[in-house]
Amino acid sequence: MAVTACQGLGFVVSLIGIAGIIAATCMDQWSTQDLYNNPVTAVFNYQGLWRSCVRESSGFTECRGYFTLLGLPAMLQAVRALMIVGIVLGAIGLLVSIFALKCIRIGSMEDSAKANMTLTSGIMFIVSGLCAIAGVSVFANMLVTNFWMSTANMYTGMGGMVQTVQTRYTFGAALFVGWVAGGLTLIGGVMMCIACRGLAPEETNYKAVSYHASGHSVAYKPGGFKASTGFGSNTKNKKIYDGGARTEDEVQSYPSKHDYV
């Protein structure tokens, strides 16, 4: 029972985590304009892995896709790759884990096969979670580096006469979604690996052995036993929020009620 619970919970946690990784990857707010200690602009810039957006005070929002592939920074490409690998591994892991679930009967699938599948999916979830965490962390590191570089030359201009606003970027919501989602996927993967131990058949069938004691003839015939160690878990099912991810390459929304102050 405990094995089923651990496996089921691991699956659900991983599912939420992978949904979060997908949401984070699609979100536009990976980096957002730093508003602290900055001239207050009437436009708000934010960027994602696939496009950059500008929201005006009027409420008009314009998003432009990164239509170049070669012109993009190597780090951004690496982050994209890590997130996609994380999603693909997670998706495969989910598919495998569905068939590995103890509560689902598929023909006459052996417990050993289910245990192997559970372990496989668990490892996939762990790698998926690590990929997401790595991707988000690389991006965050890139932001921190750029932030301090742009702070060093906050204003550039000719002889200090003409000033140019340096747009500094800070952590966007997608980074936090990505970290939480990656963590959940990782936890889910660990839970699946733990559940695998409980599913693995540890059978030791002892042959009947006759001991002939002097004066008595007693035969001991111990039956084969199955060791089932279940690890109960009271891990709460944490909810993460999705970002309103849009996938159009270029979007323009007209001035609307959602303008900011």
Epitope: V40, V54, S58, F60, E62, P255
Partner: antibody, heavy 118, light 113 residues
Amino acid sequence: EVQLQQSGPVLVKPGASVKMSCKASGYTFTDYQMNWVKQSHGKSLEWIGFINPYNGGIRYNQKFKGKATLTVDKSSSTAYMELNSLTSEDSAVYYCATIYFGNSFANWGQGTLVTVSA
Amino acid sequence: DIVMTQSPSSLTVTAGEKVTMSCKPSQSLLNSGNQKNYLTWYQQKPGQPPRLLIYWASTRESGVPDRFTGSGSGTDFTLTISSVQAEDLAVYYCQNDYIYPYTFGGGTNLEIK
């Protein structure tokens, strides 16, 4: 057609307050910020601030903080601006204007002339 | 606050002539996020409220004759009227729409001979 109808001219004494209105029609009132602009006689324009009718968010030009108070009445699609502790410096034409692309002001009211005189 | 310097302050031309007026903000109005310049041009005729001509420094508002052209980037902007008409007699203002508080230039008063 978007229309902004402003209240009529007023003559007030120094130290008094005045509240002018700007009634919007021809569009959904809560969809656009309402900006207020001051134009002293024969002079340039000065931005006072804006109010977002959708959520009540307000931003003032620091120069007019404490001088102007912006409010809205969604039910009548009307924006209001109250000016207090009036002096001769406050004698001007005050315009309301809706925001547009590029944060520009597309539609303007006809203006309310405020004259501060003893 | 951004200071918007307009020049010339006044200008007298003959109908049909080409006119250019300048607007120089004290700070760049170019937003790196979308490479747009947040500068607007208005026309104000005597006794009337201002009228929007051009936003994003070069985008003409619908209904504005194509003789009006906005150009420039960063800290140097120009409004050009290719062939001045009698009805163009007005004061022209430029406005910073990028950094709060929004600020206007002193205006260029266009007079027709």
